[in-house]
């Protein structure tokens, strides 16, 4: 959580950002809130990116003002116009690219004054893993698949019964480049699994951590998945 205060102007206003991560090829949100003004026309929002000459986005007098927008963001940005009046300056970024990573500044001007705060935006690929029983294998085998990751993650298996056990000797992980030549499909196979146990396939890179659980009993199979962005917690 980063809180910034304006330096010049009548007064400083509080602007707050939260570090976040974007999933390439999908839409992302750069989060920014501010001390609101009573009239929309008195609010100016500017998003800037370190190393980029033009603006990422500008919103003023109640509408987008994109004449100074940098080419790399053309047609890809939007604010939540109906929420600006309540202090939401967050930016929606369409079709996130690897090159969108960097330091952004959310700069706000209202009738009370000015304020800004920086935001670290990471980009990569992350997806939910699915764990299944591999019935084609000669022994009891689990297969964990996740369609899109970047940068290359680590994969670790764990089990509820054998807590702390190292499964690296009885597992095999491969990374297959997807058609766009950036993201990769993650496939990890765990051999010699036992029944009535819960196994977890944990995939992690510097952006996200995802877990796929599977519980295999004689009568049923239960699955659960969870994904957590690593750098969006308050700091």
């Amino acid at each position: 959580l980063i809180i910034g205060f304006g330096i010049s102007g009548r007064h400083s206003i509080t602007v707050t950002t939260v570090a976040s991560a974007g999933n390439i090829g999908e839409d992302g949100i750069l989060s920014c809130t501010f001390e609101p003004d009573i009239k929309l026309s008195d609010i100016v929002i500017q998003w800037l990116k370190e190393g980029v000459i033009g603006l990422v986005h500008e919103f003023k007098e109640g509408k987008d003002e994109l004449s100074e927008q940098d080419e790399m963001f053309r047609g890809r940005t939007a604010v939540f116009a109906d929420q600006v009046i309540v202090g939401n300056a967050s930016l929606r970024l369409k079709n996130v690219q690897l090159t969108d990573a960097g330091t952004y500044k959310c700069y706000i001007i209202t009738s009370k004054g000015k304020g800004n705060a920086n935001l670290e935006y990471k980009t990569g690929a992350f997806s939910m893993p699915e764990v299944n029983v591999d019935y084609n294998a000669s022994s009891e085998t689990l297969r964990c698949e996740a369609p899109r990751w970047f940068p290359q993650p680590t994969v670790v298996w764990a089990s509820q019964v054998d807590q702390g056990a190292n499964f690296s000797e009885v597992s095999n992980t491969s990374f297959e480049l997807n058609s766009e030549n950036v993201t990769m499909k993650v496939v990890s196979v765990l051999y010699n699994v036992t029944i009535n146990n819960t196994y977890s396939c944990m995939i992690e890179n510097d952006i996200a951590k995802a877990t796929g659980d599977i519980k295999v009993t004689e009568s049923e199979i239960k699955r659960r998945s969870h994904l957590q962005l690593l750098n969006s917690k308050a700091s």
Epitope: I38, K39, L40, E61, Q83, I85, V86, G87, S111
Partner: antibody, heavy 122, light 113 residues
């Protein structure tokens, strides 16, 4: 139709806290601000602040910072206001009201609850 | 904070008469960007909650009778009731929403003779 139903009257002791509720119906709760106002014989109508249930954003009148805390529960479409460290000065009728239709300002206040009388007395 | 001053504090008129009440703000409520006056009028009948009558100084809220007329600009505003009815017995408040915190006048109490 839009309705705001406030909780019943409260008799509270000095120093205590009270939590008032405002149940909204007839519109999309997360799309509009809910405002709280105080009406007392000595001070007339005073605006306390608003909450935007869609995001939880709040904005307070400086005069009521530390006195009032606004929250909202999306699942029950209910807004709440907690008043703390109550004194006789806090005895008043408190209203909730819904913010306006326009995205250019959260005013005026077109829909009001019936009001909750809070009496602070030992 | 913007101070809203209403006058008179009370007045008594007969049914059918025309009545005007005044509201003055300590600073202009006319916003140059949109040429709107950020002022509203509310009616509060005894034992009830306030009801919005007029916003943007002169725009009727839906369902409000056209005998209620809002006028004025800048710092001086007027609410006129062209032909008073018995049901108009109430306190009338002006409200500025030009800047935070929004503020209200002390009200004008309309009584029926």
């Amino acid at each position: 139709q839009v309705q705001l139903q406030e909780s019943g009257p409260e008799l509270v002791k000095p120093g205590a806290s009270v939590k008032l509720s405002c149940k909204a119906s007839g519109y999309i709760f997360t799309d509009y601000t809910i405002h709280w106002l105080k009406q007392s014989p000595g001070q007339g109508l005073e605006w306390i602040g608003w909450i935007y249930p869609g995001s939880g954003h709040t904005h307070y009148n400086d005069k009521f910072k530390g006195k009032a805390t606004m929250t909202a529960d999306k699942s029950s479409t209910t807004a709440y206001m907690q008043l703390s460290s109550l004194t006789s000065e806090d005895s008043a009728v408190f209203f909730c009201a819904r913010g306006g239709e326009s995205i250019t300002t959260v005013f005026p206040l077109a829909y009001w609850g019936q009001g909750t009388l809070v009496t602070v007395s030992a | 904070d913007i101070v809203m001053s209403q006058s008179p504090s009370s007045l008594a008129v007969s049914v059918g008469e025309k009545v005007t009440m005044s509201c003055k703000s300590s600073q202009s409520l006319l916003y140059s960007s949109d040429q709107k006056n950020y002022l509203a009028w509310y009616q509060q009948k005894p034992g009830q909650s306030p009801k919005l009558l007029i916003y943007w100084a002169s725009t009727w809220e839906s369902g409000v009778p056209d005998r209620f007329i809002g006028s004025g600009s800048g710092t001086d505003f007027t609410l006129t009731v062209s032909s008073v009815k018995a049901e108009d017995l109430a306190v009338y408040y002006c409200h500025q929403y030009y800047s935070y915190p929004p503020t209200f006048g002390a009200g004008t109490k309309l009584e029926i003779k």
